[in-house]
Interface confidence: medium
């Protein structure tokens, strides 16, 4: 089943997010991902937890998952590199780098996204864009076309309140508001983009979606710059 957790959003402008990837298992959407280099997609480590012996591939240049589109191309995965400290039972270090079988053919609909290297928190209240093919309602309806939503960044102290995530949000994580608008199941691994720069990756825990007291949790990519660089080197 798709992992992660866009509720309350709308259909994205087709191909306006050329960095967007669909990580697929046996031909079906599993998680989001973001093209960070010609041959590398960043996603969430937990996405492959249940992949077992299945075929993992990455779809780039897509808006619709099912309809033919000239820019769409499915790439095999040459190599899957989870963060060495990621573990199935925690949300920490939930990052995965997927090396494509070949360099992606770049164009208007396929383009890597610059990612944040300066390890500084995004200012609370900043509106950031999150996109994905995750479920769009509590009944679990999966969209065929890419959805997106703008979410304000939530300060860590509020996110760590006992009524919210109760201290689980480390300096390497960030939160965004989740009041009816939220990332949801199937969005895991997808990008949180602030000011045209990748700031976060949707974590793949089994958090309830759309509840303001359970804000969305995102892995801060700047905190993992050294690891990302070492893998891409």
């Amino acid at each position: 089943p798709p992992r992660g957790r866009i509720l309350g959003g709308r259909e994205a402008e087709a191909h306006a997010r050329p960095y967007m990837a669909s990580v697929q298992l046996n031909g079906a959407h599993l998680c989001g991902g973001v093209l960070v280099a010609e041959q590398w997609v960043l996603s969430a480590a937990h996405c492959l937890e249940d992949a077992a012996d299945g075929k993992v591939q990455v779809l780039l240049g897509a808006h619709s998952l099912s309809q033919p589109e000239p820019s769409k191309r499915l790439y095999d995965v040459l190599r899957a590199v989870p963060h060495p400290d990621s573990q199935p039972d925690t949300i920490d270090h939930d990052l995965l780098l997927l090396q494509l079988s070949e360099k992606a053919t770049l164009g208007p609909a396929v383009r890597p996204l610059p990612w944040q290297r300066v390890d500084r928190d995004v200012a609370p209240g900043t509106l950031c864009d999150v996109a994905g093919w995750g479920i769009v309602n509590h009944a679990g309806r999966r969209p065929d076309s890419l959805q997106h939503v703008l979410l304000p960044v939530l300060d860590r102290a509020t996110c760590n309140r006992r009524t919210h995530h109760d201290g689980a949000i480390t300096e390497r994580l960030m939160c965004a508001e989740s009041n009816r608008r939220d990332s949801c199941k199937g969005d895991s691994g997808g990008p949180l983009v602030c000011g045209g720069v990748l700031e976060g990756v949707v974590t793949s825990g089994s958090r309830v979606c759309g509840n303001r007291k359970k804000p969305g949790i995102y892995t801060r990519v700047a905190s993992y710059a050294a690891w990302i660089d070492s893998v891409l080197a």
Partner: antibody, heavy 120, light 112 residues
Framework: EVQVVESGGGLVRPKGSLKLSCAAS????????MNWVRQAPGKGLEWVAR??????????YYADSVKDRFTISRDDSESMLSLQMNNLKTEDTAMYYC???????????WGTGTTVTVSS | DVLMTQTPLSLPVSLGDQASISCRSS???????????LEWYLQKPGQSPKLLIY???NRFSGVPDRFRGSGSGTDFTLKISRVEAEDLGVYYC?????????FGGGTKLEIK
């Protein structure tokens, strides 16, 4: 609960045959590659055989020491793994473990093992 | 076949000490896909083996962070920062990069 349970071990004469079985439960058996690993008395571990899932055409792989004598197979409808062992040798005497394999190829679920003794 | 050589054969330690186990492969165990399928397993007396580390340095679920895997190419190390009584047993390295897959001979961690 995720588990695998081996059965079918026993005493067999050299050049004889034996079929080991492994019943899996608590997970989607058909999506996992499965393996047999053995351990001779007082010795280390030895990988024996692997069979991949249907999406990977049930591809099989064997250790050189058992090639052409052992056959690994699976029945996804019954969540069952088997190891048919023919032309057994005394050096095949071991505890045989049924082992599940995760996406990163690691052996994450092991059974408690079934003992095979080859002796005249 | 890839030969996996573990040293030492036996490692006597005091509780709380650091332990280090070496595993050397007879050839590079970098798979053609770029991953290095080097794992570490612990087998406690009378039990089945349990996975500790996969792809050289990734700790498996529930494995304490005092266990650290490192290395590349042909040389790999498992370090246990503060040995506890529950860590005693036989440690095996394993390569899953080249068929036939092979285990190291094992290292017995015991109390000094």
């Amino acid at each position: 609960e995720v588990q695998v349970v081996e059965s079918g071990g026993g005493l067999v004469r050299p050049k004889g045959s034996l079929k080991l079985s492994c019943a899996a439960s608590g997970f989607s058996f058909n999506t996992y590659a499965m393996n047999w690993v053995r351990q001779a008395p007082g010795k280390g571990l030895e990988w024996v055989a692997r069979i991949r899932s249907k999406s990977n055409n049930y591809a099989t792989y064997y250790a050189d020491s058992v090639k052409d004598r052992f056959t690994i197979s699976r029945d996804d409808s019954e969540s069952m793994l088997s190891l048919q062992m023919n032309n057994l040798k005394t050096e095949d005497t071991a505890m045989y473990y049924c082992v599940r394999q995760g996406y990163y190829w690691y052996f994450d679920v092991w059974g408690t093992g079934t003992t095979v003794t080859v002796s005249s | 076949d890839v030969l996996m050589t573990q040293t030492p054969l036996s490692l006597p330690v005091s509780l709380g000490d650091q332990a280090s186990i070496s595993c050397r492969s007879s050839q590079s165990i970098v798979h053609s896909n770029g991953n290095t399928y080097l794992e570490w397993y612990l087998q406690k007396p009378g039990q089945s083996p349990k996975l500790l580390i996969y792809t050289v340095s990734n700790r498996f679920s529930g494995v304490p962070d005092r266990f650290r895997g490192s290395g590349s190419g042909t040389d790999f190390t498992l370090k246990i920062s503060r040995v506890e009584a529950e860590d005693l047993g036989v440690y095996y390295c394993f390569q899953g990069s080249h068929v036939p897959w092979t285990f190291g001979g094992g290292t017995k961690l015991e109390i000094k």
